[in-house]
C-alpha cells in the first residue's frame, strides 16, 4: 500500500510580473517531484533579499527564463 | 481596492457541520494563497489554514486537523471552509485573509468576518 | 498558549514611545520574516508593518518594526488616542507542519 503523501510546494502565492534580471540577486527552479507535483521558480531579489514565487507559465517570466540562460551562456567559457 | 466578503457564520450545535464562504475582489484571486483565521471572544488570533494560489498545497492548525477543510474556486473568486465535527471551542469570529504574495507566506487584506456560535 | 510572545498590555501618554517585543523561536522569527497587525476595537485586523520593517501605503511613519534573532519589536513614536488598539506579531514556521503563528497579542492604551 502506497504511503499518502502531503503535497510540500513552497509557493502559496505566485507573481506574473515581470522582473528587470538586474534586479535579481538568484533564480532558483525547482523540478517537479514526488513532494511538488508543479515547477516552482523562486526569485530572490538583490533590493532587500525580498523572496517572490513566479509563474511558469506567464510569458514575462518565460522571457525572463530566457534572458537569465542567455546571460548565463555569455559568462560560460 | 481588495475587497473580501465571508458569508455563512450562524449558530450551529456541537458536532454539526457549517460551511463559510468568502467572495474575493480587487485583486488577481488565481494567484494569491488565502488564509482562515479566528479570534474566539475576548482572545487573540489564532491562524486556521491556507490554500495555495492553484489549490494544490493546504496546510491546517492541529486543532482543526482532521475536520475541517480549506477550499476555493477560483472561477468564482471564492474561498471555502468547510467546518465539519464542530466544538464549543470552535466558537469564534472566522477572517479570510488574502496572502502577501512573497515567500514566506503572510497575511495582508482582511475581511470583515462572520461569527461562529457552536452551542447545545 | 501561543507559540510568539508578547507582553499583554503597555501604555505610554500621547507623544512618548511604547515598544512591543515579540519572541519566537529558531523554525519561526529565527529563519522568516514577522509581521505585525493592529486591531481597532470592534474591527476586523490590519496589517501594519511586514518583512519585518516595511510600512504598506497609508501607515503612518511613527510606526517602525525591527528584528533580530528569534525576536522582534514594534515601536510606536509620537503615540496619538487613536493608537489604542491590539497588536499581534506573527510569523510563517517551518517546523514539520508548515503554518502560521501569531503572538497573543499586546493592548496598547494611551493614559
Known amino acids: 500500500v502506497p504511503l499518502s503523501r502531503t503535497v510540500r510546494c513552497t509557493c502559496i502565492s505566485i507573481s506574473n510580473q515581470p522582473v528587470n534580471p538586474r534586479s535579481l540577486e538568484k533564480l532558483e527552479i525547482i523540478p517537479a517531484s514526488q513532494f511538488c507535483p508543479r515547477v516552482e521558480i523562486i526569485a530572490t531579489m538583490k533590493k532587500k533579499g525580498e523572496k517572490r514565487c513566479l509563474n511558469p507559465e506567464s510569458k514575462a517570466i518565460k522571457n525572463l527564463l530566457k534572458a537569465v540562460s542567455k546571460e548565463r551562456s555569455k559568462r560560460s567559457p | 481596492q481588495v475587497q473580501l466578503v465571508e458569508s455563512g457564520g450562524g449558530v450551529v450545535q456541537p458536532g454539526r457541520s457549517l460551511r463559510l464562504s468568502c467572495a474575493a475582489s480587487?485583486?488577481?484571486?488565481?494567484?494569491?494563497?488565502m488564509h482562515w483565521v479566528r479570534q474566539a471572544p475576548g482572545k487573540g488570533l489564532e491562524w486556521v489554514a491556507v490554500i495555495s494560489y492553484d489549490g494544490g498545497t493546504k496546510y491546517y492548525a492541529d486543532s482543526v486537523k482532521g475536520r475541517f477543510t480549506i477550499s476555493r474556486d477560483n472561477s468564482m473568486k471564492t474561498l471555502y471552509l468547510q467546518m465539519n465535527s464542530l466544538r464549543t471551542e470552535d466558537t469564534a469570529v472566522y477572517y479570510c485573509?488574502?496572502?502577501?504574495?512573497?515567500?514566506?507566506?503572510?497575511?495582508?487584506?482582511w475581511g470583515q468576518g462572520t461569527m461562529v456560535t457552536v452551542s447545545s | 498558549q501561543s507559540v510568539l510572545t508578547q507582553p499583554p498590555s503597555a501604555s505610554g501618554t500621547p507623544g512618548q514611545r511604547v515598544t512591543i517585543s515579540c519572541s519566537g523561536s529558531s523554525s519561526n522569527i529565527g529563519s522568516n520574516t514577522v509581521n505585525w497587525y493592529q486591531q481597532l476595537p470592534g474591527a476586523a485586523p490590519k496589517l501594519l508593518i511586514y518583512t519585518n520593517n516595511q510600512r504598506p501605503s497609508g501607515v503612518p511613519d511613527r510606526f517602525s518594526g525591527s528584528k533580530s534573532g528569534t525576536s522582534a519589536s514594534l515601536a510606536i513614536s509620537g503615540l496619538q488616542s487613536e493608537d489604542e488598539a491590539d497588536y499581534y506579531c506573527a510569523a510563517w514556521d517551518d517546523s514539520s507542519e508548515p503554518r502560521v503563528v501569531f503572538g497573543g497579542g499586546t493592548k496598547v492604551t494611551v493614559l
Open positions: 480587487g485583486f488577481t484571486f488565481s494567484t494569491y494563497g
Open positions: 485573509a488574502k496572502d502577501l504574495g512573497d515567500l514566506p507566506p503572510g497575511l495582508d487584506y
